[in-house]
Every structure is written in structure tokens, then in C-alpha cells.
């Protein structure tokens, strides 16, 4: 058993049929010594008496808010949550496996630049009685500070018969050095509580591996005289790290016909312009990637040829 926060405790249980559970000692936070009784949740049924109470916790019916009383007055509370371990593996019932980039991916994180700011998100089908708490650090043995905000519901989607809820959180490394080579990974830890069930999820990454630039901005077409060719130009996204001479991007320019089946013409360039043939009803799209490190491509920025 360990304390999650004041008056909230997590009991770690091996979860199998007829498991003996854990014996937990509860102590009433009071100077009183006599006449103390204990109840669980809203029940008026008395569980026991005394300043300390030893209880057996083996199922969710044993979790909940234990309250000590004296003469009808509430003295203190202890909320017990359960963390299930089945066949040596902690439960992952609350969050959905996103299966990207690999199985058992519950947290996904992205950074728009090297400033030390990043966003993580996760999915669940649970809509109520759900709380999240996020902590992060650079390294784990001698952790350096990363400050995370509160997790917020960022999207709701309908997937077949189910509703899916996306939560996200923004974090910022306290003393980020954008140009430095990373040697210790960022660690992100999410505590998830659904009713009386506790779970924790972790992710470990280097900022360089989660970089995904915003799409190029100000995408423009300039027709070339007496030609079907056009000059496409764009700019670095505002959110990308500066100076651009050091934090350089490479770009992919694509000409796509109206039909998905039509052949795509693609040009790769380190410049912020390119000359392409603009077919009727086609569109031109440009995306960006870190020039020196193969992290994710940005989403496409697009304009119609006409």
C-alpha cells in the first residue's frame, strides 16, 4: 500500500480466484483514543472499532472511503483504491491501446519543435468517474524538471457503437536546451483513476524522436509564363525552432489529381519553393520534416491548382 495523495491510498493486489488479498492497517487521524468506530462508504454498518483498524482487502467491495467516527462526529477519511496485477502484469483497463507505432502504446506524444514543449494524449471509452494526473521528468535516477499542466478532454469521437474520448496534456521542460544532444530520455507518467480502480501508464522518449513540425505556412502558387508549370512557395511554420539555418527542414511537394487513383508526382527539396506541373483539377500539397533527423512528417498544407 502507498499514498497517492493526502488520505488516498493505493492497494496493490495480485488478482486471481480466491486470492488472499492484502492486510491493510488504517489509522484514524485524531488525538482521540477511545470510542472510535469505522464505516465504509455510505453504509451505516460498523466495520470495527479502535484508533487503528486492520482490514483485509481482496476485491473492489473492500475499496472505497473508510471513515472513523466518534459520537456521530466524523474524525477522518481514508480512500482506498485498488491496483490489479494479473499474471504478473498490471492492469490496463482504463486506457485504449492505440497500437501506433506498436502494440501496448497507451500514451502518444508529439513536439512541434525543440523548445522542450510537448503534448501527450491518450484514449478511453470511459466517460464518467475518471481522473488523470500527469508527472514528467528528464531521466529517472537524477530527474530534471518537466512541468505538466492538467489533463483535459480534447476530443470526442464515435467509433461504431462506442464513444471514444481523447485526453491531452501539455508539458514543458524547465531548463530546455534546444541545440543540445539529448542523452537522457523524457519520462512521462500518467496516473489514471476510474471509480476505485487505479492504473498507471508511462512513456519514455527523446524530444528528437517525437518531433512533428506544423505544416508549412503561406503556401502560394505563381504561374510561369507560357508554361503549364507553376512555382510553389511556402514558409517555415511559425512554431518551428529558430534559427532556421540551424534548425532546418526538408520538404515534400506533391501534385495529386482529383482521383486518388491518379499517379502522384512528388518532389523533395530543402528550399522553400519548387517548380511543378499543375494539372487541371489537381491540388498541390507540401509537408515538412526535420532535415537532419528522420522524425515524423508534418501534415500536408494544400492549395488547388486552379
Amino acid at each position: 500500500i502507498w499514498e497517492l495523495k493526502k488520505d488516498v491510498y493505493v492497494v496493490e493486489l495480485d488478482w486471481y480466484p480466491d486470492a488472499p488479498g492484502e492486510m491493510v492497517v488504517l489509522t484514524c487521524d485524531t488525538p482521540e483514543e477511545d470510542g472510535i468506530t469505522w464505516t465504509l462508504d455510505q453504509s451505516s454498518e460498523v466495520l470495527g472499532s479502535g484508533k487503528t483498524l486492520t482490514i483485509q482487502v481482496k476485491e473492489f467491495g473492500d475499496a472505497g472511503q473508510y471513515t472513523c467516527h466518534k459520537g456521530g462526529e466524523v474524525l477522518s477519511h481514508s480512500l482506498l483504491l485498488l491496483h490489479k496485477k494479473e499474471d504478473g502484469i498490471w492492469s490496463t483497463d482504463i486506457l485504449k491501446d492505440q497500437k501506433e507505432p506498436k502494440n501496448k502504446t497507451f500514451l502518444r506524444c508529439e513536439a512541434k519543435n525543440y523548445s522542450g514543449r510537448f503534448t501527450c494524449w491518450w484514449l478511453t471509452t470511459i466517460s464518467t468517474d475518471l481522473t488523470f494526473s500527469v508527472k514528467s521528468s528528464r531521466g529517472s535516477s537524477d530527474p530534471q524538471g518537466v512541468t505538466c499542466g492538467a489533463a483535459t478532454l480534447s476530443a470526442e469521437r464515435v467509433r461504431g457503437d462506442n464513444k471514444e474520448y481523447e485526453y491531452s496534456v501539455e508539458c514543458q521542460e524547465d531548463s530546455a536546451c534546444p541545440a543540445a544532444e539529448e542523452s537522457l530520455p523524457i519520462e512521462v507518467m500518467v496516473d489514471a483513476v476510474h471509480k476505485l480502480k487505479y492504473e498507471n501508464y508511462t512513456s519514455s522518449f527523446f524530444i528528437r524522436d517525437i518531433i512533428k513540425p506544423d505544416p508549412p505556412k503561406n503556401l502560394q502558387l505563381k504561374p510561369l509564363k507560357n508554361s503549364r508549370q507553376v512555382e510553389v512557395s511556402w514558409e517555415y511554420p511559425d512554431t518551428w525552432s529558430t534559427p532556421h539555418s540551424y534548425f532546418s527542414l526538408t520538404f515534400c511537394v506533391q501534385v495529386q489529381g482529383k482521383s486518388k487513383r491518379e499517379k502522384k508526382d512528388r518532389v523533395f527539396t530543402d528550399k522553400t519553393s519548387a517548380t511543378v506541373i499543375c494539372r487541371k483539377n489537381a491540388s498541390i500539397s507540401v509537408r515538412a520534416q526535420d532535415r537532419y533527423y528522420s522524425s515524423s512528417w508534418s501534415e500536408w498544407a494544400s492549395v488547388p491548382c486552379s
Epitope: T37, E45, V46, I55, K58, E59, G61
Partner: nanobody, 115 residues
């Protein structure tokens, strides 16, 4: 008629063991929280242990934790209290109850721990 009858008490040396039984009739112990209490000579009654409905999770007073074990046999409709490493201060009249306030309780069985 709702009834509880305890048995298994006796005289035992310090460090010894006893197993108390509480046979219930007129109701099912598996549907109720069940309690063991004790009353030492010249003292008030003291809660010892509780067993809950469902999976039968248990609770113990500080004075007996790690030494006493409460259990039940639903088929026999009987409650038990296994008492190990007995001490002279465990000497008391032990009784089982269906309610915290002792509305439904047995007459008790005497346990004496003495050398």
C-alpha cells in the same frame, strides 16, 4: 427463531491456541456482516473481528491482528475464530453477533489464558 450459539472456549496456557465456533440458525451468515466481541471481567465489551458478506473480507482489532483469524463455513452456517499465540490479556467471554449493537448475539463462551 434467530439464534447464535458459541462453543470451543476453555482454559489454555499462554502461547496456546483455541478455535471458537458460532452456529447460526434462523438466518444465513453469508448474507450478513458477522462479528466477534469479547468482554473481560470488570470491563466493557470489546470488538475483536468482522467478516463481511460477498468474498468474506475481514477486519481485526489492533490487539488481535496477526494472531486471530475469523472465517466462516456457509454450508454449515457457522462462524469461526481461530486464536493463536494466546496471552493472559485475551481472557474474556467471547461472543458472536449479527449486528454491531448486539441485537442478535450469542450467550458467549469463556476463554481463560493462564499458566
Amino acid at each position: 427463531e434467530v439464534q447464535l450459539v458459541e462453543s470451543g472456549g476453555g482454559l489454555v496456557q499462554p502461547g496456546g491456541s483455541l478455535r471458537l465456533s458460532c452456529a447460526a440458525s434462523g438466518f444465513s451468515i453469508s448474507d450478513n456482516w458477522m462479528y466477534w466481541f469479547r468482554q473481560a471481567p470488570g470491563k466493557g465489551h470489546e470488538w475483536v473481528s468482522t467478516i463481511k458478506t460477498g468474498t468474506g473480507s475481514t477486519a481485526y482489532a489492533d490487539s488481535v491482528k496477526g494472531r486471530f483469524t475469523i472465517s466462516r463455513d456457509n454450508a454449515k452456517n457457522t462462524l469461526y475464530l481461530q486464536m493463536n499465540s494466546l496471552k493472559p490479556e485475551d481472557t474474556a467471554l467471547y461472543y458472536c453477533a449479527r449486528d454491531w449493537d448486539g441485537t442478535v448475539r450469542g450467550q458467549g463462551t469463556q476463554v481463560t489464558v493462564s499458566s
